[in-house]
Interface confidence: medium
């Protein structure tokens, strides 16, 4: 896992190699300058987009070589005891449902990318966060309602999935489902008044100042 120094370094993508090269070049040219990561990412992204297939080729070769290295090293790598069990994720297990904010992002990310093709991933995420914060609670409702329904479905699915796996796990699943319903009631956030008490937002949804659910 995180702490195993013997674990092979993860494989790098062609774009990651390109960014690494950019960084090295920048360091050579400006050894003492501190890097504005957001600006730097933006510039790299813009440059990558304008590069020809031929120019990108060298980085793709580097990525291919690194992939081969990673696969080779992983064949001989023995993870520490207990890690394999912990790390295993059943591909048949129900997927965690997306939050309202995530659903909102899925809808608006392509629009932002279309309007601002040069924006880095970080800047797109920042813009999405700002947009969500400035969205009135009534406009958030379709995402919240869909997220609530997906969450409900997930809780049923995960309880059924656990029941199939272990007889006593079903009970755990039901308890967990009830608990998360209670959590939802305790965190009825963003719906009505802006209040003196600070609201706790669910998961990765950004905090928002709003006045009601209408």
């Amino acid at each position: 896992g995180k702490g195993d120094p013997k674990k092979p370094r993860g494989k790098m993508s062609s774009y990651a190699f390109f960014v690494q090269t950019c960084r090295e070049e920048h360091k050579k040219k400006h050894p003492d300058a501190s890097v504005n990561f957001s600006e730097f990412s933006k510039k790299c992204s813009e440059r990558w987009k304008t590069m020809s297939a031929k120019e990108k080729g060298k980085f793709e070769d580097m990525a291919k070589a690194d992939k081969a290295r990673y696969e080779r090293e992983m064949k001989t790598y023995i993870p520490p005891k207990g890690e394999t069990k912990k790390k295993f994720k059943d591909p048949n297990a129900p997927k965690r449902p997306p939050s309202a904010f995530f659903l909102f992002c899925s809808e608006y990310r392509p629009k932002i990318k279309g309007e601002h093709p040069g924006l880095s991933i970080g800047d797109v995420a920042k813009k999405l966060g700002e947009m969500w914060n400035n969205t009135a609670a009534d406009d958030k409702q379709p995402y919240e309602k869909k997220a609530a329904k997906l969450k409900e479905k997930y809780e049923k699915d995960i309880a059924a999935y656990r029941a199939k796996g272990k007889p006593d796990a079903a009970k755990k699943g039901v308890v967990k489902a009830e608990k998360s319903k209670k959590k939802k009631e305790e965190e009825e956030d963003e719906e009505d008044e802006e209040d003196e008490e600070e609201e706790e937002d669910e998961e990765d949804e950004e905090e928002e100042e709003d006045d009601d659910d209408e």
């Epitope: 409702q141 379709p142 009825e188 008044e193 802006e194 709003d210 209408e214």
Partner: antibody, heavy 125, light 108 residues
Amino acid sequence: AVQLVESGGGLVQPKESLKISCAASGFTFSNAAMYWVRQAPGKGLEWVARIRTKPNNYATYYADSVKGRFTISRDDSKSMVYLQMDNLKTEDTAMYYCTAPRRTEGIVSSGVDYWGQGVMVTVSS
Amino acid sequence: YELIQPPSASVTPGNTVSITCSGDELPKRYAYWYQQKPDKSIVRVIYKDSERPSGISDRFSGSSSGTTATLTIRDTQAEDEADYYCHSTYSDDKLPVFGGGTKLTVLG
């Protein structure tokens, strides 16, 4: 306890103006959006106007039937919300309710649920 | 955008009655239900499709499926006689929408 008290209703002639008021107490007024809802005699409820809070630039919204004639405003320092009604028509005759969102048991809940007792506005020649 | 409710419904004491509310946006929007008694006082009985505010009898329940929201009152009492309005938000107007209201009569 939360209270919303409307005042200023009465009998006016068509094309005249009237301003109704709503005094709020018992909750943090500056943090709540405020609404006016009306009910014509023997008819259903109709949303008239909404005003949001300072962080939301006091944004206002109106029902199509009153757009351009009615103006909602608020005074956070006095916990008051107003509805200025100009160029009144006979079809504006109704009981006007001042309403606000509410919090239940420390949980933010949904739906407008503080209602005043209403004030009657009659437009007739 | 409209929310359609039946104008009237009737029930005998002790029985269950359901009032429906239909609207194209209801799959995406929450439904809220209000009770207006003959004295004109207004109380919210259901919010967010199926949540019941504190102080509201558990005889009142709400559900929503597709374009229809439903308010159900079981073991109906004489004091439940009132007008019931559904409401939903609608982002284009930035103002909510009310249904036309359903007059519930408790017979007997």
